[in-house]
């Protein structure tokens, strides 16, 4: 069998055996290593020799095999974008940011850049749940049945009404969407103006 | 300006090694530029020995590859050449030189130096 | 290892006259990967030319370079009393880096 071409070698179709670790280089019609994550390219290559790969300095980085001739600046979350940081800057990877809580991303270009306050759920609803925390605005879902939530609010959750024999009372009023169930002692009637309390 | 010389030794016994250090003044060994060993028998045409870079990363002469070693001291801004097991078919002069950017000819060369082979 | 033949050995003309060197490759190499060498008694060489036609800092213009797939040429438009002297040309198309055996240009 042919022995394994190592870089430089000549490439007349302008492709290169190793994709993610090589690339074709058109000035010199040949394939060359690219660098490693954490590095850049210190010396280009040549049909003599390879690419000569260098780390990357502090606060940059290069985060896939690549042929750059320099290392990208290290960035920090930007508080008054919204965002805060989740993992450090390395050699290898970027700052790792995040909306912070109560706010989503509203603008994405293959990052989020710009996060915004979530929007609020009227009472009688909740947000719907997200995979991803901080990706979208909320989208706000009829509390189901037996619960209610009773505030504007962009994260409160619907609870479930308050079952009043568990606590030895009798149901002076039933919960709805927006309110819970109104207990009293079954032994007292319970006044008009007191609805909405619980009478012990 | 840039100059680069060579020093060593001018007389090496057979099967012994042949050391050389080239000494670089006015540039940094350090900016990417490769460097070469470059050797002219008496009376005879050039042969290329070999490259290296401040990485430490070399290229050699497949001829020479078995008998050579260069490596390169940053803090001193030199680097060196090693060729063991001499004869008499190495002397030669012997010429460092700087490796011309991207491209792989040679733009400043040392003067030389001489090294004879012999008991 | 790509060979560089380069003739005439020895090339015999007065001041003032046109020199052409030749240096053949044993294979095609790009026009691209061809440099040519002055060098004078007890000295090392210089570098002339780069990329077969593309003179080095400080080379007069009386020295020009051509050539493509095996044959390459040095032109010495009008030559110097200092421009008797010996060139090599080199090729880096494919390691290892090999030089033609040298043309000497000397006074008629």
């Known amino acids: 069998s042919q022995p394994q071409a190592v870089p430089p070698y000549a490439s007349e179709n302008q492709t290169c055996r190793d994709q993610e670790k090589e690339y074709y280089e058109p000035q010199h019609r040949i394939c060359c290593s690219r660098c490693p994550p954490g590095t850049y390219v210190s010396a280009k290559c040549s049909r003599i020799r390879d690419t000569v790969c260098a780390t990357c300095a502090e606060n940059s980085y290069n985060e896939h095999w690549n042929y750059l001739t320099i290392c990208q600046l290290c960035r920090p979350c930007d508080p008054v974008m919204g965002l805060e940081e989740i993992a450090p800057c390395t050699s290898k990877r970027k700052t790792q940011c995040r909306c912070q809580p109560g706010m989503f991303c509203a603008a994405w270009a293959l990052e989020c850049t710009h996060c915004e306050l979530l929007s609020d759920c009227p009472p009688g609803t909740e947000a719907e749940l997200k995979d991803e925390v901080g990706k979208g605005n909320n989208h706000c879902v009829p509390c189901k049945a037996g619960h209610f939530q009773n505030t504007s609010s962009p994260s409160a959750r619907c609870q479930p009404h308050t079952r009043c024999e568990n606590q030895g009372l009798v149901e002076a009023a039933p919960g709805t969407a927006q309110s819970d169930t109104t207990c009293k002692n079954p032994l007292e009637p319970l006044p008009p103006e007191m609805s909405g309390t619980m009478l012990m | 300006q840039v100059q680069v010389q060579e020093s060593g030794p001018g007389l090496v016994k057979p099967s012994d090694t042949l050391s050389l250090t080239c000494a670089v003044s006015?540039?940094?060994?350090?900016?990417?530029?490769?460097w070469g060993w470059i050797r002219q028998p008496p009376g005879k045409g050039l042969e290329w020995i070999g490259y290296?870079?401040?990485?430490?990363?070399?290229y050699y002469n497949p001829s020479l590859k078995s008998r050579v070693t260069m490596s390169v001291d940053t803090s001193k801004n030199q680097f060196s050449l090693k060729l063991n097991s001499v004869t008499a078919v190495d002397t030669a002069v012997y010429y460092c030189?700087?490796?011309?950017?991207?491209?792989?000819?040679?733009?400043?060369w040392g003067q030389g130096t001489m090294v004879t082979v012999s008991s | 290892e790509i060979v560089l033949t380069q003739s005439p050995g020895t090339l015999s003309l007065s001041p003032g006259e046109r020199a052409t060197l030749s240096c053949r490759a044993s294979?095609?190499?790009?026009?691209?990967?061809l440099a040519w060498y002055q060098q004078k008694p007890g000295q090392a060489p210089r570098l002339l030319i780069y990329?077969?036609?593309s003179r080095a800092t400080g080379i007069p213009d009386r020295f020009s370079g051509s050539g493509s797939g095996t044959d390459f040429t040095l032109n010495i438009s009008r030559l110097e009393p200092e421009d008797f002297v010996v060139y090599y040309c080199?090729?880096?198309?494919?390691?290892?880096?090999?030089f033609g055996g040298g043309t000497k240009v000397e006074i008629k």
């Open positions: 080199q090729q880096y198309y494919l390691s290892p880096l090999t």
């Open positions: 290296i870079h401040y990485s430490g990363n070399t």
């Open positions: 294979q095609s190499i790009s026009s691209s990967y």
């Open positions: 006015g540039y940094s060994i350090s900016n990417s530029i490769w």
């Open positions: 990329g077969a036609s």
């Open positions: 030189a700087r490796n011309f950017g991207d491209v792989d000819a040679f733009d400043i």
